[in-house]
């Protein structure tokens, strides 16, 4: 239990890294999770025997010891960093403060019917970071119902005032609720030359894009490769942003990358998790510690169980030198960047590791694909599930999907006749249907949620939640798969998976060993051609050969359509229904995963 | 180079406790987590206890939890792990080990020390 219950009526003395203003405690708490140097921090509340100006101060610190002195002061509210905690970490804030005024930039008022309405309009603005709503009860006639979208250089507000009959809340893209769309490609030999917000020093672009896409006023940036001419500028980061928000001017520069933040998709990319090693490359920093290790991976495990180290670099030992161990440098810096990038010393360098639990874990890289072949192997799809009914006799009755650690993603009707949900055992991390014995571990349901709307498969809605009795502890066998990003509904997969333990032919029997085939995605004006006699929907998405051949059928239902973009696994739909199995032009149709993401967010989010 | 020497173990009946230290050197002890592992007869490695570099922050397995308790001296560089209510099934080669779930070096701990519960 890492320490994540706040002290009332305490001040950590000394430690100061910077002030910030948050509406409550908890939101401080996350903001110094979030900064690079944050372990402790001390919430100022509003109290009258405050000074208000010192309302909602969230002061940062930090400490080579981890703790600092604790002093009694009334409405001083301190905690610790999640970093020292093992659990997932999320920068999403849902709540709505009242009677508060968040100050920022006011860049754009309009009217809103609500502050839903108003926290939507924030969401899907690429600028905002937050927003202040005045209520109908607003006592200026004129700015009632007026919808304020604001932004800061930090993300954070300047100050916060009470006001009544005002509300203020965050912009919600870092809990996957935005529209706006998600530019993931980079572009080699480009320079864009919008104003610079700050810059930082990175091994790659990728690394740089990561690093744009937390810092709250980035928008897209440009990065100069180690073969970038000017000496002085070598693995320069250079974080941009602009008015439209998007870059008013491209150059063509050689040995220069660019590309965009990557905001409102970063539930479904890994944006702190940097767990590549860069060779032949040095980082500089503070130095934290100096140990010798027998590898660069086991550098980077130091690096990453020492709370305060940020990145690392190893000199491998000269030969016949000290047991063959080499020296693992330790460092940190102001911003969680190296200071400078040096090349050609022959040092290995990195991350910590530390900090890929603030990103979704269904980002994690997983085993490589098996290649040929239709068996799965052990761990090729660790979000899979085999759901059984124990009615009347236990049997596979569906497939699922882990997307959440108490969240399984299925198909509404494998649940016809299904009276309750204790009837139900949700297998995970399984292989082979013959490894399910009457002592095999399951997860019980708690609840099924079907959609509303759902009445028969063809007719689409063909979704539902199982809500699990217990949470899943994420293995390399078991792990959840991403959503996809509703800013990424016009990429194009081209990587796509069907598995499941169905018949292979339409008269056949359940499967022993789960089964994978790659499958094309089929457009829905192909796919409507197809089946004359049903309406394919923007809620569905098809898939499957000309030739048929392969395809999902009895067995699968509920299982994943997956389909790998940019190194990442998305859950791209479900399987649904079709005429017969692999039958020529007769896709498979799933339904459309994206089409749903309020609704799985809506009620696996609900409190 | 890291090392780490654990003590303390012991055969001991059911309901009884026992203290375990764990001596480090070889690095900065204060700045990083550390952890309790365990390995039963004939089973892997568990993960049985672990606490922060803050000595704040501490994790414990379901199985011990209430029973056993985490606690480092950061002078001395020494890692301890008390143990109540000793059961059978808490028969295992307890190793300290560098870091915490779920980022424990497995690879990085000591030679171990033998606790036996039996009546």
């Known amino acids: 239990e890492c320490v994540t219950q706040l002290l009332k009526d305490t001040c950590f003395e000394g430690g100061d890294i910077t002030t910030v203003f948050t509406p409550s405690a908890k939101y401080c708490q996350v903001v110094c999770t979030y900064h690079p140097r944050c372990l402790l921090f001390t919430f100022t509340a509003e109290s009258p025997s405050e000074d208000p100006t010192r309302w909602f101060t969230c002061v940062l610190k930090d400490s080579v010891t981890e703790t600092l002195p604790r002093v009694n002061r009334t409405a001083a509210i301190s905690g610790y960093s999640f970093k020292q905690c093992s659990h997932q970490i999320s920068a999403c804030n849902k709540d709505i403060y009242v009677d508060l005024d968040m100050k920022g930039i006011n860049y754009n008022s309009s009217v809103a019917k609500s502050a839903q309405e108003c926290q939507e309009r924030c969401t899907d603005d690429v600028h905002c970071h937050f927003f202040t709503y005045a209520t109908r009860q607003f006592p200026s006639l004129e700015h009632r119902n007026i919808c304020l979208l604001k932004h800061t250089q930090t993300g954070t507000p300047t100050r916060i005032t009470k006001l009544d009959k005002v509300v203020s809340g965050f912009s919600l893209k870092s809990c996957a609720l935005s529209n706006l769309a998600c530019i993931r490609d980079i572009f080699p030999n480009t320079v864009f030359a919008d104003s610079n917000i700050d810059s930082v020093m990175a091994p790659d672009a990728f690394v740089c894009g990561r690093i744009c896409t937390h810092h709250p006023g980035c928008l897209f940036f440009t990065f100069f490769s180690q073969e970038w001419p000017k000496e002085s500028q070598r693995n320069l980061c250079l974080l941009k942003t602009s008015e439209s928000g998007l870059p008013s001017t491209r150059i063509k520069k050689s040995k220069a990358l660019s590309g965009f933040s990557l905001q409102s998709c970063r539930h479904s990319i890994p944006v702190f998790c940097h767990s590549s090693f860069y060779h032949d490359t040095d980082f500089l920093g503070e130095e934290l510690d100096i140990v010798a290790a027998k590898s660069h991976e086991a550098c980077q495990k130091l690096c990453t169980n020492a709370v305060r180290c940020q990145f690392f670099t190893y000199t491998p030992a000269q030969a016949s030198c000290n047991e063959g161990k080499g020296k693992c440098y330790l460092k940190l810096s102001s911003n969680g960047s190296p200071t400078k990038i040096l090349h050609g010393r022959g040092g290995i360098s990195g991350y910590t590791l530390r900090l890929c639990k603030m990103d979704n874990e269904c980002t994690t890289k997983i085993k490589p694909r098996i290649v040929g072949g239709t068996a799965s192997v052990r761990g090729e799809w660790p979000w899979q599930v085999t759901l059984h009914t124990t009615s009347p006799t236990q049997r596979h009755l569906c497939g699922g999907s882990i997307i959440g650690n108490q969240w399984i993603l299925t198909a509404a009707h494998c649940f016809y006749g299904v009276e309750s949900p204790k009837i139900l055992r949700v297998y995970s991390g399984i292989l082979n249907q013959s490894e399910i014995k009457e002592d095999t571990s399951f997860f019980g349901v708690q609840e099924i949620i079907i959609h509303d709307q759902y009445k028969m498969a063809e007719s689409g809605y063909d979704i539902a939640l199982l809500k699990l009795e217990t949470t899943v502890n994420y293995t390399d066998s078991q792990r959840p798969i991403c959503l996809p990003s509703k800013g990424d509904r016009n990429v194009i997969y081209t990587d796509c998976w069907v598995t499941g333990w169905g018949y292979r032919k339409l008269r056949d029997k359940i499967q022993n060993t789960l089964q994978k085939a790659k499958i094309p995605l089929v457009t829905n004006e192909e796919c409507q051609k197809r089946y004359r006699g049903h309406k394919i929907t923007h809620k569905m998405i098809c898939a499957g050969y000309r030739e048929g051949g392969k395809d999902a059928c009895k067995g699968d239902s509920g299982g994943p359509l997956s389909c790998k973009h940019n190194e990442v696994w998305h859950l791209v739909g479900i399987t649904s229904w079709g005429e017969g199995c692999a039958q020529r032009e007769r896709p498979g149709v799933y339904t459309n995963v994206v089409e749903y993401v309020d609704w799985i967010l809506e009620k696996t989010q609900a409190v | 180079q890291v090392q780490l020497q654990e003590s303390g173990g012991g055969l001991v009946q059911p309901g009884g406790s026992l203290r375990l230290s764990c001596a480090a050197s070889g690095f900065t002890f204060s700045l990083y987590d550390m952890s309790w592992v365990r390995q039963a007869p004939g089973k892997g490695l568990d993960g049985v206890s672990g606490?922060?570099?803050?000595?704040?922050?501490?994790y414990y397995a379901d199985s011990v939890k209430g029973r056993f308790a985490i606690s480092r001296d950061d002078a001395k560089n020494t890692l301890y792990l008390q143990m109540n209510s000793l059961k059978i099934e808490d028969t295992a080669v307890y190793y300290c080990?560098?870091?915490?779930?779920?980022?424990?070096?497995?690879?990085?701990r000591g030679q171990g020390t033998q606790v036996t519960v039996s009546s």
């Open positions: 080990a560098l870091g915490r779930p779920p980022y424990t070096d497995y690879d990085s």
């Open positions: 606490i922060g570099g803050d000595g704040g922050s501490t």
